[in-house]
Interface confidence: low
């Protein structure tokens, strides 16, 4: 039987004979920045070209003896996981290795930078097909390393990195914290986050997804036919690099944003046991385990969206937090969340010619998060319509009045410290789906978009008695673009999207003595693109 | 993921151009910043990545590196330019004393300087 990790990333719908075509990833070149490798290992022989790039620090310690097999151990194993003949993910991918880690697995930020520059120069000298760069390494947060990754990503290169093995917030490490990089955490055969001694996989909002990373069988540098089991977020990142190579080989024109959205879309959802993560990180950490798409084609018609959390605003009175989408993505909605419930809502605003999502802390609040819903919507023209506080008992309303524009998200923002519990008596007159409704003391912001064939509808789930969590999901074929709460009263902690489900969280009702007057409604806006569906049918 | 102005230790050295007549003051209203790894054991003091502003050409990077070496030499400091970056980021890698940081931050075109640090196989 195939190793557990390859089994795990293979969707059940694959027929046995269709399991990872032998030439999977053949149009893609994967660069590996790691230790030296044993390129004549039977798993990777003829598949990995060792470049002449080497930039490593001296080994520590006077008694350190350089043993070739130990020097090659980490890189050889990872090359095998990406493209190995027997135990590799993308068996057809060709690889190029750069040595940036010494025999003790240690390197420098500067050496890694020079390696990334080497790749960019190689790309300019001899442009090839899609490039994937695997960075199975981590250091402390580095502005310069993140900046270099951003530049390379904007040059069309897909970068995949290890989240780090420090059982810590991945945002504190680089290149894991670089927004343009696909950051991968590690899970085991039981879908538990991987424990590594006293530490384990990193977590948090800077992780894009998880992948198998414990007891991964791959090429061992001890001999040319040896295999060994290794564990870590490097192994997890290698799986995702392999999956990316497979996807890019099937669809070479995919952009980084499209690839990331597909990786998220085809992942196994909600299978990780979140109890392993610190409580404050659970909501921020994606519950996604990477998998290959069920077939190499046919995803083009989907409207893909993902949720992007901001950094925490911090507790100061006027603190704000900003969540941004990638350059090729559209911000279709914006929400906010505060564990204390003390927040002043959120708004979509233009920054550098692009919409961002900004959340506002309130006096006495411990801080807020902004949550952006970032979607792939070709030829979209989106704008924000705002209505100031109405002060009327009916509450504040705003709608999309431009011809052909549909509502994709609602946000509300208020200046008062506490909205109180005044609830608009009418939440939304039926037959007016393009309308956002909110508290009378709040400004309401509607995200209105025009895109070919885009259609959206509003789904609500209201619970008469106060609940700590209310959810509403979009049905099959529809994608969640907007998630908000009605009413925006002070006991609502916030709203956020998890996959295709809108989650509204409220304060623990047992401690707040809430009444049924404070019942909460979760409001989801679900969209689909008939244009994308038609385009994909025409292709087939 | 992390914003570029995110959670790392930052040391902003205010520029007082009168302290060093040899250094050109940077463009009005901008302050070059110094960054180092928040995890002390991973720091590699003595090697620095000097990152220049985005549109800086290779020739300007080389000129800025030479200027740093010249000004350091006048103060009796040895420096070594280990690498000049171009293609991804404009800038250079320099081996020098931390005592030269304030001088380096005042050089023209400098956006920020980061002390080198370790990375590890995961």
């Amino acid at each position: 039987s195939i190793p557990w990790n390859l089994e795990r990333i293979t969707p059940p719908r694959y027929r046995a004979d269709e399991y990872q075509p032998p030439d999977g990833g053949s149009l893609v070149e994967v660069y590996l920045l790691d230790t030296s490798i044993q390129s004549d290992h039977r798993e990777i022989e003829g598949r990995v070209m060792v470049t002449d790039f080497e930039n490593v620090p001296e080994e520590d310690g006077t008694r350190f003896h350089r043993q070739a097999s130990k020097c090659d151990s980490h890189g050889t194993h990872l090359a095998g996981v990406v493209s190995g003949r027997d135990a590799g993910v993308a068996k057809g991918a060709s690889m190029r290795s750069l040595r940036v880690l010494n025999c003790q697995g240690k390197g420098t930020v500067s050496g890694t930078l020079i390696g990334l520059e080497f790749i960019r120069k190689s790309q300019l000298v001899q442009p090839v097909g899609p490039l994937v760069v695997l960075l199975p390494l981590a250091g402390g947060y580095s502005r310069v390393l993140n900046a270099a990754c951003q530049r390379l990503a904007r040059a069309g290169v897909v970068l995949v990195t290890a989240a780090g093995n420090f059982r810590d917030d991945a945002c504190l490490y680089s290149p894991a914290s670089a927004p343009e990089v696909i950051t991968v955490g590690a899970t085991n055969a039981q879908d538990q986050p991987v424990t590594l001694g006293t530490l384990g996989t990193n977590f948090g909002r800077c992780v894009d997804l998880f992948a198998p990373g414990e007891d991964i069988i791959g090429a061992s540098s001890d001999c040319s036919t040896c295999f060994v089991s290794q564990s870590g977020t490097s192994q997890a990142a290698a799986h995702v690099a392999g999956i990316a190579a497979m996807m890019l080989s099937a669809e070479p024109e995919l952009t980084l944003a499209e690839l990331r959205q597909r990786l998220i879309h085809f992942s196994a959802k909600d299978v990780i046991n979140e109890a392993w993560f610190p409580e404050d990180q659970r909501v921020l950490t994606p519950n996604l385990v990477a998998a290959l798409p069920p077939s190499t084609h046919g995803a083009g018609w989907q409207l893909f969206c993902r949720t992007v959390w901001s950094a925490h605003s911090g507790p100061t009175r006027m603190a704000t937090a900003i969540a941004r989408c990638a350059p090729d993505e559209e911000l279709l909605s914006c929400s906010s969340f505060s564990r204390s419930g003390k927040r002043r809502g959120e708004r979509m605003e233009a920054q550098g010619g692009k919409l961002v999502c900004r959340a506002h802390n309130a006096f006495g609040g411990e801080g807020v998060y902004a949550i952006a819903r970032c979607c792939l919507l070709p030829q979209a023209n989106c704008s924000v319509h705002t209505a100031p506080p109405a002060e009327a008992s009916m509450g504040t309303r705003v709608h999309c009045h431009q011809q052909g524009h549909v509502l994709t998200g609602c946000s509300s923002h208020w200046e008062v410290e506490d909205l109180g519990t005044h609830k608009p008596p009418v939440l939304r007159p039926r037959g007016q789906p393009n309308q956002c409704v909110g508290h009378r003391e709040a400004s309401i912001h509607a995200s209105c978009c025009h895109a070919p064939g885009l259609e959206c509808k509003v789904k609500e789930h209201g619970i008469p008695a106060p609940q700590e969590q209310v959810t509403v999901a979009c049905e099959e074929g529809w994608t969640l673009t907007g998630c908000s709460a009605l009413p925006g009263t002070s006991h609502v902690l916030g709203a956020y999207a998890v996959d295709n489900t809108c989650v509204v969280r409220s304060r623990d009702v047992s401690t707040t003595g809430s009444t049924s007057e404070e019942a909460v409604t979760a409001v989801a806006i679900c969209c689909r693109s008939r244009h994308l569906a038609q385009a994909s049918q025409e292709l087939q | 993921q992390e914003d570029e102005d995110g959670d790392y230790e930052e040391l902003v050295l205010a520029l007082r151009s009168e302290e060093d007549g040899l250094a050109e003051a940077p463009e009005h209203g901008t302050t070059a910043t110094f960054h180092r790894c928040a995890k002390d054991p991973w720091r590699l003091p003595g090697t620095y990545v000097v990152v220049l502003k985005e549109e800086t050409h290779l020739s300007q990077s080389e000129r800025t590196a030479r200027r740093l070496q010249a000004q350091a030499a006048r103060r009796g400091y040895l420096t070594k330019i280990l690498h000049v970056f171009h293609g991804l980021l404009p800038g250079f890698l320099v081996k020098m004393s931390g005592g030269l940081l304030e001088l380096a931050l005042k050089l023209p075109h400098v956006d920020y300087i980061e002390e080198d640090s370790s990375v590890f196989a995961q």
Epitope: E7, R8, N188, T195, D215, F227, S229 | -
Partner: antibody, heavy 118, light 113 residues
Framework: EVQLVESGGGLVQPGGSLRLSCAAS????????MNWVRQAPGKGLDWVST????????NYADSVKGRFIISRDSSKHTLYLQMNSLRAEDTAVYYC???????????WGRGTLVTVSS | DIVMTQSPDSLAVSLGERATINCKSS????????????LGWYQQKPGQPPNLLIY???TRESGVPDRFSGSGSGTDFTLTISSLQAEDVAVYYC?????????FGQGTKLEIK
């Protein structure tokens, strides 16, 4: 030949300690998680503990947690079970079992008998 | 913990006849990510260690005769011996490996009638 051979069993008093060993051969030891499973006389099978191929992850049955320690030596291709604070109810044949890396056991040793009695 | 319950506790079947052993888990062992049931069947002959017969609830281990078959999904599983042979006299155990602690059924003793 692919096989597992347990040793180290015997008679021990309650509260005493014993160390079981399991020598593996015929397969790449480092690639597979390993387990200890026990069987009290005339009774069914009872999983005791597992250790991952790298040795980085261990799991124990509640009944032995804090008393037993599973470990492995890659260079010797040997699995160990250090049993402390033994009780009468620990009396059983202890089997060493190779894990398929999913949690089912595709190779078993012949077992070693541990008797805890005063 | 997942509790595994086998039925019957013992079974006597004539040579050449069909033998059926059932196993029920206290919670589903079907893993939705790969659509696999994390359930195995073992045979233990007197004085011998157990031997893996079936994994993934229905996949025969190599070398196991094709008269042995496994079926079921979720919480209810069955081991079937289509035509009982003398060498099949043993105790049969089901095991879930969905999560630790891994747990076995109490065993079913199969004899010849």
């Amino acid at each position: 030949e692919v096989q597992l051979v347990e040793s180290g069993g015997g008679l021990v008093q309650p509260g005493g300690s014993l160390r079981l060993s399991c020598a593996a051969s015929g397969f790449t030891f480092n690639n597979y998680a390993m387990n200890w499973v026990r069987q009290a006389p005339g009774k069914g099978l009872d999983w005791v503990s597992t250790i991952s191929g790298s040795g980085g992850t261990t799991n124990y049955a509640d009944s032995v947690k804090g008393r037993f320690i599973i470990s492995r030596d890659s260079s010797k291709h040997t699995l160990y079970l250090q049993m402390n604070s033994l009780r009468a109810e620990d009396t059983a044949v202890y089997y060493c079992a190779k894990d398929s890396n999913w949690g089912n056991f595709d190779l078993w040793g012949r077992g070693t008998l541990v008797t805890v009695s005063s | 913990d997942i509790v595994m319950t086998q039925s019957p506790d013992s079974l006597a079947v004539s040579l050449g006849e069909r033998a059926t052993i059932n196993c029920k888990s206290s919670q589903s062992v079907l893993y939705r990510s790969n659509n696999r049931n994390f359930l195995g069947w073992y045979q233990q002959k007197p004085g011998q260690p157990p031997n893996l017969l079936i994994y993934w609830a229905s996949t025969r281990e190599s070398g196991v005769p094709d008269r042995f078959s496994g079926s079921g999904s979720g919480t209810d599983f069955t081991l079937t011996i289509s035509s009982l042979q003398a060498e099949d006299v043993a105790v049969y155990y089901c095991q879930q490996y969905y999560t630790t602690p891994y747990t076995f059924g109490q065993g079913t003793k199969l004899e010849i009638k």
